[in-house]
């Protein structure tokens, strides 16, 4: 298969509500009409799939119903949002992009975005 460059930010800090967003940009060598995007998490040398979506160029990304990810696409950019994150989910989140159709098939894998998640401190009890 053919290689393709994928760029993503090096570091992202999740919000206090456990939401992290980042852009995954790919250098499309051709005019792909069908694209698959996969987010993988690498931590302690283990790799797990977080979510995956396919989309037709110009349309919304379609994730599975139970996915913790949402996203939108614009040209060769995919705006990804991961929700429900906790401190234990801190790790390197790698964006993988495949140009599925038309041929040839292209595959690009980003260097990863280190997402830091800090669990919010519980609110102190009030005396009021």
């Amino acid at each position: 298969c053919k290689a393709m460059h994928v760029a993503q930010p090096a570091v992202v800090l999740a919000s206090s509500r456990g939401i992290a967003s980042f852009v995954c940009e790919y250098a499309s060598p051709g005019k792909a009409t069908e694209v698959r995007v996969t987010v993988l998490r690498q931590a302690d040398s283990q790799v797990t799939e977080v979510c995956a979506a396919t989309y037709m160029m110009g349309n919304e990304l379609t994730f599975l119903d139970d996915s913790i990810c949402t996203g939108t696409s614009s040209g060769n950019q995919v705006n990804l949002t991961i929700q429900g994150l906790r401190a234990m989910d801190t790790g390197l989140y790698i964006c993988k992009v495949e140009l599925m159709y038309p041929p040839p098939y292209y595959l690009g894998i980003g260097n990863g975005t280190q997402i830091y998640v800090i669990d919010p401190e519980p609110c102190p009890d009030s005396d009021f």
């Epitope: 298969c1 290689a3 996969t38 690498q42 790799v47 797990t48 995956a52 595959l107 894998i109």
Partner: nanobody, 119 residues
Framework: EVQLVESGGGLVQAGGSLRLSCAAS????????MGWFRQAPGKEREFVAD????????YYAGSVKGRFTISRDNAKNTVYLQMNSLKPEDTAVYYC????????????WGQGTQVTVSS
């Protein structure tokens, strides 16, 4: 070192069926993502279908959706491609591929098996 060996190709008439097999040796097959690709003479290599190690989720190219089915038998270290309602444009060499982690791409490829669909 992972080795992939395809079988099941051949000559079939349009509308017919074939089942391709890809036997893997070496490594932990159940953790691999497995895929099928094809390449027709003078054309670029084309994605056909794949099956993820996680939950066995499948994905198909639009051109084969509804006609081809990918499946795996982890006990036999084998992935299959059931091809029904074959068309002359399905004629190609079909390659099996394996990805170890998902972050290194398709790490291993078979030698391919020829499928010819006559009209």
């Amino acid at each position: 070192e992972v080795q992939l060996v395809e079988s099941g190709g051949g000559l079939v008439q349009a509308g017919g069926s074939l089942r391709l097999s890809c036997a893997a040796s070496g490594g932990t097959f159940s953790s691999y993502g497995m895929g099928w690709f094809r390449q027709a003479p003078g054309k670029e290599r084309e994605f056909v279908a794949d099956i993820r190690s996680s939950a066995g989720r499948t994905y198909y190219a639009g051109s084969v959706k509804g006609r081809f089915t990918i499946s795996r038998d982890n006990a036999k270290n084998t992935v299959y491609l059931q091809m029904n309602s074959l068309k002359p444009e399905d004629t190609a060499v079909y390659y099996c591929a394996a990805e170890m982690t998902g972050i290194t791409g398709w790490d291993y490829w078979g030698q391919g098996t020829q499928v010819t669909v006559s009209s």
